[in-house]
Amino acid sequence: GPVPPSTALRELIEELVNITQNQKAPLCNGSMVWSINLTAGGFCVALDSLTNVSGCSAIEKTQRMLSGFCPHKVSAGQFSSLHVRDTKIEVAQFVKDLLLHLKKLFREGQFN
């Protein structure tokens, strides 16, 4: 039968957990991405920020998974108004922040 979207969200969370746990060298060679207001922007803004990262196989699946939660095509810089005061952070930190945000969504049952 139908599967609640929370199952897909759990899959995304598990992927982010894998990335943070398996990280040895600097993630994506220490690439920097825009820090964003996840509460205000959600999945599309997260994808927008990560779209700037290329050639990093470690987050390829995350980028693709995020697109499944965003209703439209995202191009880099599309949500620049939701960047946090033009602040950039490392991809590793971005992934950790995103993971915390998604865990909170999951706990609150916002996808059931």
Epitope: G1, P5, T7, A8, E11, T51, R64, G68, F69
Partner: antibody
Framework: EVQLLESGGGLVQPGGSLRLSCAAS????????MSWVRQAPGKGLEWVSA????????YYADSVKGRFTISRDNSKNTLYLQMNSLRAEDTAVYYC????????????????WGQGTTVTVSS | SYELTQPPSVSVSPGQTASITCSGD??????ACWFQQKPGQSPVLVIY???KRPSGIPERFSGSNSGDTATLTISGTQAMDEADYYC?????????FGTGTKVTVLG
């Protein structure tokens, strides 16, 4: 390793029925949307149907609407395609394909395909 | 219904660049994917999200998408790149595949 194994193809007469199965392994089957794509001999790829993972929505190509039914059994990690009122133009290799996650699964990109099962509709 | 049009064939010499176009109404507003299919084999995704390469796909494959046209470019084409190539997009609750392009590597 993600694997998809189709079965159920064969020779059937016009107007007949056939049910294809796709056994999935190596991933959380229930989370992902799944599709059927076919390819007639010497022709291009044609999408047939999709079943979303998150919402249980189904989608069909106009060419099979009302004749084909896609379904899934998440407890068995299996995708199905029930094909009724088969026509000669349904003759093709049918591929089972892993789609993406979430309500907009179609943004993901179909990167896991089965080896295909052949359906021949002929009298 | 939505249609994606590709040239039937493209010929290229080894080491040269092959470009395959895929045309559809406002295709640039959608994500485009590209698949490679060799005879007797299942299709392989070579480009997703217009220009992203899945892991394991050589750097010589690249993509772009704007306006009404998506383009797959194979730089430094090798004999092993000889295959059929299909673009794909999603429109109005259906997947649409392009008509397909046979890439022939000369020589």
């Amino acid at each position: 390793e993600v694997q998809l194994l189709e079965s159920g193809g064969g020779l059937v007469q016009p107007g007949g029925s056939l049910r294809l199965s796709c056994a999935a392994s190596g991933f959380t089957f229930s989370s992902y949307a799944m599709s059927w794509v076919r390819q007639a001999p010497g022709k291009g790829l044609e999408w047939v149907s999709a079943f979303s993972g998150s919402g249980g929505s189904t989608y069909y190509a106009d060419s099979v609407k009302g004749r084909f039914t896609i379904s899934r059994d998440n407890s068995k990690n299996t995708l199905y395609l029930q094909m009724n009122s088969l026509r000669a133009e349904d003759t093709a290799v049918y591929y089972c394909v892993q789609d993406g996650l979430g309500p907009y699964f179609y943004n993901y990109g179909m990167d896991v395909w089965g080896q295909g099962t052949t359906v021949t509709v002929s009298s | 219904s939505y249609e994606l049009t590709q040239p039937p064939s493209v010929s290229v010499s080894p080491g040269q660049t092959a470009s395959i176009t895929c045309s559809g109404d406002k295709l640039g507003d959608k994500y485009a994917c590209w698949f490679q299919q060799k005879p007797g084999q299942s299709p392989v995704l070579v480009i997703y999200h217009d220009s992203k390469r899945p892991s394991g796909i050589p750097e010589r494959f690249s993509g772009s998408n704007s306006g009404d046209t998506a383009t797959l470019t194979i730089s430094g084409t090798q004999a092993m790149d000889e295959a059929d190539y299909y673009c794909q997009a999603w429109d109005s609750s259906t997947y649409v595949f392009g008509t397909g392009t046979k890439v022939t590597v000369l020589g």
